[in-house]
Amino acid sequence: ITQQDLAPQQRAAPQQKRSSPSEGLCPPGHHISEDGRDCISCKYGQDYSTHWNDLLFCLRCTRCDSGEVELSPCTTTRNTVCQCEEGTFREEDSPEMCRKCRTGCPRGMVKVGDCTPWSDIECVHKESGTKHSGEVPAVEETVTSSPGTPASPCS
């Protein structure tokens, strides 16, 4: 059918602290060795893992961008938590950057919601009370396949 690509990050440098996996898995704050025999601790402030796993390397800690504040630092079991600075927000559908909140509502509209790190100010029409985001709705595209006979593996 479809060949699916996965692109893991580069492996972090080997760690010293080791313990044995349980049921083939390593606890949060660790990753597994390639032979599956050892659990290796993540490096504090550099990488992390949040669940029991068999990752070959810990996940790289996020660095907060300029325009963001660090709410909590990266530990071996939790990624950095970043938040947009006051007056800016990040929407779930555009998480790559903090955008400036609007300073006011368009004519004929009233403000019913303040700027938060997660949302722009909210405006509604004075008469109807209908929300207005100022955004054009996005169209979601899905790729479908309609196979006939059983598919052979992709090369």
Epitope: L6, A7, P8, Q9, P21, S22, E23, G24, L25, P27, I32, D35, G36, T50, H51, W52, N53, D54, L55, L56, F57, L59
Partner: nanobody, 115 residues
Framework: VQAGDSLRLSCAAS????????VGWFRQTPGKEREFVAA????????YYADSVKGRFTISRDNAKNTVYMQMASLKPEDTAVYYC???????????????????WGQGTQVTVSS
Amino acid sequence: VQAGDSLRLSCAASGRTFGSIRVGWFRQTPGKEREFVAAINRNDGTTYYADSVKGRFTISRDNAKNTVYMQMASLKPEDTAVYYCAAGLQYNRSADRVPVGAVYWGQGTQVTVSS
């Protein structure tokens, strides 16, 4: 495909490695959470299946090709979903057989089974 037909999905790592020892498949239908389907340990070949697909689906691997396959037989209309290959499976407890999520995801492929 029609109910009762077979299909094979394949999943290849784009880099040198999948980034984890176990690789699996999840599926998702509109408005529902992704659900675990099957997983395989690429080192020793141990397999894990959701009850709903046991005996019908077979997960296998070709380490030389860095590829994992899922052979789906006796397909039912309720198998209709978007199927995702996943690596870096995440578990709440070491004894769990069913992962709660994954770190790396394929782009997904639609499987539609009509009656």
